[in-house]
Amino acid sequence: MSSKYPRSVRRCLPLWALTLEAALILLFYFFTHYDASLEDQKGLVASYQVGQDLTVMAAIGLGFLTSSFRRHSWSSVAFNLFMLALGVQWAILLDGFLSQFPSGKVVITLFSIRLATMSALSVLISVDAVLGKVNLAQLVVMVLVEVTALGNLRMVISNIFNTDYHMNMMHIYVFAAYFGLSVAWCLPKPLPEGTEDKDQTATIPSLSAMLGALFLWMFWPSFNSALLRSPIERKNAVFNTYYAVAVSVVTAISGSSLAHPQGKISKTYVHSAVLAGGVAVGTSCHLIPSPWLAMVLGLVAGLISVGGAKYLPGCCNRVLGIPHSSIMGYNFSLLGLLGEIIYIVLLVLDTVGAGNGMIGFQVLLSIGELSLAIVIALMSGLLTGLLLNLKIWKAPHEAKYFDDQVFWKFPHLAVGF
């Protein structure tokens, strides 16, 4: 069956995407070069492995995690890859322009690719709230705006609040969540009669979503430790993240059973709740001084995630038009906030322990930092939502929401699948 893209989008998408790609190639040609310094090759390989972990998380983990819709699994995986590929390119340039450009050239290192992959991951988290309701041309816009907003947020936070790479990147959870939710709020919401089945999950796509969750679960310690500058901090981050996600799995599965009248386990709850601990410890993963604290945090995060998955979808579906299985947005918004609160608590403990009276000042600055991240996420998300509503993008009609056949060619299918 041939693509059901409207004729105008068939013209618009390739033209828009390829023009953008050509522009990126030109920017790379004029403004970038590789770091040519002699380096220890073993260190180079180890550094690449961290980047590889992040790419696996993004492409396979988040790609498959969002693929649980009955009739939108192909699009979820492939559109995620498309956004990742585009997002990384733009993020490398943007980070370079914001941090290195006074020198005239952007030096590309494995670290800059690592940073860019993490920036692109933000889009993949956000897009969970809108996948199935937008086409690729709209997703290109979303990638460009979100990566730009996150890059600028990180630079502003670094300059105003004097925070390091890890701290300003760990706002990614709340930023991505609120960005995605505000974009979703702007998009047409009601699902017309006869299309309700499309946003339901099916067994095979749900299995692939579980596969995505497993990949994310395995590599979350790499994500949380990727931007820390010393081995001891990285070791702490890896251990604490691992303990937290381990406990959140146990909590997610048992909590899901507890939340069901017949004691059955919900696939949707488990998909996202297994990651809860990793999100919650993200900001303070290197600071948590002992395993039991990380485990308690994993437990609390798992319970919040399951509770949120049980009670929030109704509200999100009504207000934002987000389907029941796309729970990453509100999940990450709650857990990201929990993580930020934990960081502030640790900051207070540190200040008290050091015996000086600057607690209010430090807390105020941390709250300011978090508020700035949320405000920029909401504003840029609303801007993106308004842009996506423009007629120029030929958005899929509401009747074509969550339908792979709008975007993909299935020669062996006459109708449906």
């Epitope: 260190g43 290192t109 670290f111 500058r229 010393s230 322990g353 430090q362």
Partner: antibody, heavy 125, light 106 residues
Framework: EVQLLESGGGVVQPGRSLRLSCAAS????????MHWVRQAPGKGLEWVAV????????EYADSVKGRFTISRDNSKNTLYLQMNSLRAEDTAVYYC??????????????????WGQGTLVTVSS | AELTQSPSSLSASVGDRVTITCRAS??????LNWYQQKPGKAPKLLIY???SLQSGVPSRFSGSGSGTDFTLTISSLQPEDFATYYC?????????FGQGTKVEIK
């Protein structure tokens, strides 16, 4: 005993290049971030560049960005600073310093716990 | 974060109590270190994390402060303490130094 020994300094003309080395011994070099700090004659200390323990990230002071490159070879326990397009204002004693990370009550803190003896770079025509 | 040290120089006698202040342009929490440098020598770490004494440093040296205002105190100045003192922030790159305070014999 921890030792940092700089070499490679000397007199060089403006616009030319120079490469400084810092040989480390007495500690596990590959687990420490390393820095270059300089001090112009009669002036204060100025941070120049840092390279992370695994070489994955490098950061520079605005005054040297695009001209200087920091690198390390963990198999040789050596830190380098490649200085290109040298200017008169780059004249200084260059120190390499080890960054140690220690835990406070909760937060981590960083310090330059060991320094080399310094090597003098004079940029003059 | 820019660091401003005061005074830029001071004259004191052996046995005096000496206080040097360092002000940061931004919040650096407690990420502040103090170094001592003698002519022709490399700097030596005295205090890290605003108030922690580096091992091997005499207890007459102490540090305090948090956020933006910091102090180095030498409780009883000794002959070997006449040198230049620098504060340095390690909160975030670029790691900046204060302009230095020269402690001279009165």
């Amino acid at each position: 005993e921890v030792q940092l020994l700089e070499s490679g300094g000397g007199v060089v003309q403006p616009g030319r290049s120079l490469r400084l080395s810092c040989a480390a011994s007495g500690f596990t070099f590959s687990t420490y971030g390393m820095h270059w700090v300089r001090q112009a004659p009669g002036k204060g200390l100025e941070w120049v560049a840092v390279i992370w323990f695994d070489g994955s990230n490098k950061e520079y002071a605005d005054s040297v960005k695009g001209r200087f490159t920091i690198s390390r070879d963990n198999s040789k326990n050596t830190l380098y600073l490649q200085m290109n397009s040298l200017r008169a204002e780059d004249t200084a004693v260059y120190y390499c310093a080890r960054e140690e990370v220690v835990r406070g009550v909760i937060l981590w803190s960083r310090k330059f716990d060991y320094w080399g003896q310094g090597t003098l770079v004079t940029v003059s025509s | 974060a820019e660091l401003t040290q005061s005074p830029s120089s001071l004259s004191a006698s052996v046995g005096d109590r000496v206080t040097i202040t360092c002000r940061a342009s931004q919040n650096i929490r407690r990420s502040l270190n103090w170094y001592q440098q003698k002519p022709g020598k490399a700097p030596k770490l005295l205090i890290y994390a605003a108030s922690s004494l580096q091992s091997g440093v005499p207890s007459r040296f102490s540090g305090s402060g948090s956020g933006t205002d910091f102090t180095l105190t030498i409780s009883s100045l000794q002959p070997e303490d006449f040198a230049t003192y620098y504060c340095q922030q390690s909160s975030n790159t670029p790691w900046t130094f204060g302009q230095g305070t020269k402690v001279e014999i009165k």
